[in-house]
């Protein structure tokens, strides 16, 4: 079970619920955009494999002052089993490739959708 810190509902949240919540949030932040997501900030691309939640958080946590992704960061905090802080990098980062947050979100969202359809919640 995964515990999502900072969420309104207390107690542990099943991984399937957390994954669905993350998908819904990513879709939400891409809808009806009036300005570029996070002002066009760039983040490190990641390998969408095991440890993906922590790697995604490590990339996104380095984006400051972007309220649009605060909730995404919070959900990822709950899905990542270890503490992540800014400036931290894992081997899952494609360190030579930086992409816009908007593109990062598309890549992550597609991968999460595939996991959800396949029933891979962990």
């Amino acid at each position: 079970l995964t515990c999502l810190g900072g969420f309104a509902s207390p107690g542990p949240v099943p991984p399937s619920t957390a994954l669905r919540e993350l998908i819904e949030e990513l879709v939400n932040i891409t809808q009806n955009q009036k300005a570029p997501l996070c002002n066009g900030s760039m983040v490190w691309s990641i390998n969408l494999t095991a440890g993906m939640y922590c790697a995604a958080l490590e990339s996104l946590i380095n984006v400051s002052g972007c309220s649009a992704i605060y909730r995404t960061q919070r959900i990822l905090h709950g899905l990542c089993p270890h503490k992540v802080s800014a400036g931290q990098f894992s081997s899952l980062h494609v360190r030579d490739t930086k992409i816009e947050v908007a593109q990062f979100v598309k890549d992550l969202l597609l991968h999460l959708k595939k996991l959800f359809r396949e029933g891979q919640f962990n």
Partner: antibody, heavy 118, light 109 residues
Framework: QVQLQESGPGLVKPSETLSLTCSVS????????WSWIRQPAGKGLEWIGR???????NYNSSLKSRVTMSIDTSKNQLSLKLSFMTAADTAVYYC????????????WGQGTLVTVSS | SYVLTQPPSVSVAPGQTARITCGGN??????VHWYQQKPGQAPVLVVY???DRPSGIPERFSGSNSGNTATLTISRVEAGDEADYYC????????????FGGGTKLTVV
């Protein structure tokens, strides 16, 4: 409702540079990726490239040396320049908006026919 | 470079089910999008990210994607479904780019 409108010359001479403009209305140009796609008569779709409001571009490698894309957020317009035109570049040229949540194209212009001939 | 292969044509009787395939190396790992294009018109998105449908697109249109083949399925085919259909993917590599399939002409006989 987002609307895209391509404009430019219908006829271009060989070796000249094609300049097309795509005007976007009903939505902000600065929050999405935008692409140019072309289609020769009776043939399939060919992606030319994409641009983001930051000016960052990705181009089709087979056209890269001839393509320049730009974006003018103040006018809500995109532009495409394709140099050294040949008869093989004769096609309907479309601009399209990349969806916010995927790499699909959710809005397209009606297309503009460009013929290369002397 | 990445190649998407579609059959040039598919024929189906009204009321039957049409299946249009799109083949590509390990395409199951990519998000596949499908477009319908009628003569003289711009393409219209009918399925995105393998199996999601944009608003306004009938439930008769569905998609699947695994292994080396993606499939667009149109159930209870109508005469108005006759069109060209294109699959499309985003190739995320050192050279980010978009690839379209060659297109499939769906004929309702």
């Amino acid at each position: 409702q987002v609307q895209l409108q391509e404009s430019g010359p219908g006829l271009v001479k060989p070796s000249e540079t094609l300049s097309l403009t795509c005007s976007v209305s009903g939505g902000s140009i600065s929050s999405y990726y935008w692409s140019w796609i072309r289609q020769p008569a009776g043939k399939g779709l060919e992606w030319i490239g994409r641009i983001y409001m930051t000016g960052r571009t990705n181009y089709n490698s087979s056209l890269k040396s001839r393509v320049t894309m730009s974006i003018d957020t103040s006018k809500n317009q995109l532009s495409l320049k394709l140099s050294f035109m040949t008869a093989a570049d004769t096609a309907v040229y479309y601009c399209a908006r990349e969806s916010g949540s995927s790499y699909s194209y959710d809005y397209w212009g009606q297309g503009t026919l460009v013929t290369v001939s002397s | 470079s990445y190649v998407l292969t579609q059959p040039p044509s598919v024929s189906v009787a009204p009321g039957q089910t049409a299946r249009i395939t799109c083949g590509g190396n390990n395409i199951g790992s990519k998000g596949v999008h499908w477009y319908q294009q009628k003569p003289g018109q711009a393409p219209v998105l009918v399925v995105y990210d393998d199996s999601d449908r944009p608003s306004g697109i009938p439930e008769r249109f569905s998609g699947s994607n695994s292994g080396n083949t993606a499939t667009l399925t149109i159930s209870r085919v109508e005469a108005g479904d006759e069109a060209d259909y294109y699959c499309q993917v985003w190739v995320s590599s050192s050279d980010h780019h978009v690839v379209f399939g060659g297109g499939t002409k769906l004929t309702v006989v």
